[in-house]
């Protein structure tokens, strides 16, 4: 069975109303520009076959992909929210840098790969969708990692 290592975030990360609000505002701005409402990136399929104790590691992978492959290319858009939310998410990513699981992470990698492929396939609209789901990313990190 997978064993988690340091897959933990302090609850205080999620107790700052200002940055919570900015994250939600950024997600809302992007979701208004997203007209592909049938596709959900952070939803039932992402968590399928992954036990709750391994979901922080799963969300770490999604967070890192979102930062590197989505927020970086779109960093000029959705200001001023983007310039405030990216450092916050980077801080969470750094706090999870030692989060690993030893054991079978096949389901996790498969689910993350599916998410990445969906974003890539949709191109820029996939990136917009991922930004529009930052509220879900935020809540999922809180649920899984605290």
């Amino acid at each position: 069975l997978p064993v988690n290592t340091r897959c933990k975030l302090e609850v205080s990360n999620f107790q700052q109303p200002y940055i919570v609000n900015r994250t939600f505002m950024l997600a809302k701005e992007a979701s208004l520009a997203d007209n592909n409402t049938d596709v959900r990136l952070i939803g039932e399929k992402l968590f399928r076959g992954v036990s709750a104790k391994d979901q922080c590691y799963l969300m770490k992978q999604v967070l890192n992909f979102t930062l590197e492959d989505v927020l970086l290319p779109q960093s000029d858009r959705f200001q001023p929210y983007m310039q405030e939310v990216v450092p916050f998410l980077t801080k969470l990513s750094n706090q999870l840098s030692s989060c690993h699981i030893s054991g079978d992470d096949q389901n996790i990698q498969k689910n993350v790969r599916r998410l990445k492929e969906t974003v890539k396939k949709l191109g820029e609209s996939g990136e917009i969708k991922a930004i529009g789901e930052l509220d879900l990313l935020f809540m999922s990190l809180r649920n899984a990692c605290v």
Epitope: R40, A52, Q55, D135, N143
Partner: antibody, heavy 121, light 111 residues
Framework: EVQLVESGGGVVRPGGSLRLSCAAS????????MNWVRQAPGKGLEWVSG????????DYAASVKGRFTISRDNAKNSLYLQMNSLRAEDTALYHC??????????????WGRGTLVTVSS | QAALTQPASVSGSPGQSITISCTGA?????????VSWYQQHPGKAPKLIIY???KRPSGVSNRFSGSKSGNTASLTISGLQAEDEADYYC??????????FGGGTKLTVLG
């Protein structure tokens, strides 16, 4: 088959306390966030409290914050709601509810039948 | 936190389509990524019929569909049937880590 069975309701005086329990079966309990939702007689649904899979986050409606405490015992497949300083407006049927899928407790896909709490002098 | 706003009642004849709206301030529902809809028959526990805005749980009829636009989420029931007569509630998870419900809509199937 997913089953949620609430217990612990009853009649209590204003200012009194009750502890509700929810016994879960038919699924891996510690893979899911859980909630308490209440419904006053003839009224709508009101979310009371929620807890994530490991008890690390516990959230409350403003109307019960400071008076109610949610907890879970994963070894016993049980969810609890400790209710203190009860008021007449807390009178309701209290449901235990599980997230539809692991990772999103706010989609309440499975519900117990509820346990009735009556606060009356 | 104020409840989301739903019409108190809607009605329709068998075979018709009806739509129930659910409106909230942007602070309540963010981008509406968290919207769920529940059906409740008298004396029964609520039943999840839409989650994640527009997804249907297995076993729920495809006559039920969900959507969002701006600050309003909607539930549409097509091909109305007598057994659809019930109370319907929308809900959303919020940026304050709470769940808010709408006040509920009583659906009457005429005839």
């Amino acid at each position: 088959e997913v089953q949620l069975v609430e217990s612990g309701g009853g009649v209590v005086r204003p200012g009194g306390s009750l502890r509700l329990s929810c016994a879960a079966s038919g699924f891996t309990f510690d893979d899911y966030g859980m909630n308490w939702v209440r419904q006053a007689p003839g009224k709508g649904l009101e979310w009371v409290s929620g807890v994530n899979w490991n008890g690390g986050t516990r959230d409350y409606a403003a109307s019960v914050k400071g008076r109610f405490t949610i907890s879970r015992d994963n070894a016993k497949n049980s969810l609890y709601l400790q209710m203190n300083s009860l008021r007449a407006e807390d009178t309701a049927l209290y449901h235990c509810a599980r997230g539809w899928y692991s990772g999103a407790a706010w989609n309440m896909g499975y519900w117990g039948r509820g346990t009735l709490v009556t606060v009356s002098s | 936190q104020a409840a989301l706003t739903q019409p108190a009642s809607v009605s329709g004849s068998p075979g018709q389509s009806i739509t129930i709206s659910c409106t909230g301030a942007s602070g309540d529902v963010g981008a509406y990524n968290f919207v769920s809809w529940y059906q409740q028959h008298p004396g029964k526990a609520p039943k999840l019929i839409i989650y994640d805005v527009n997804k249907r749980p297995s076993g729920v009829s495809n006559r039920f569909s969900g959507s969002k636009s701006g600050n309003t989420a909607s539930l549409t029931i097509s091909g109305l049937q007598a057994e659809d007569e019930a109370d319907y509630y929308c809900s959303s998870y919020t940026s304050t880590f709470s769940v808010v419900f709408g006040g509920g809509t009583k659906l009457t199937v005429l005839g």
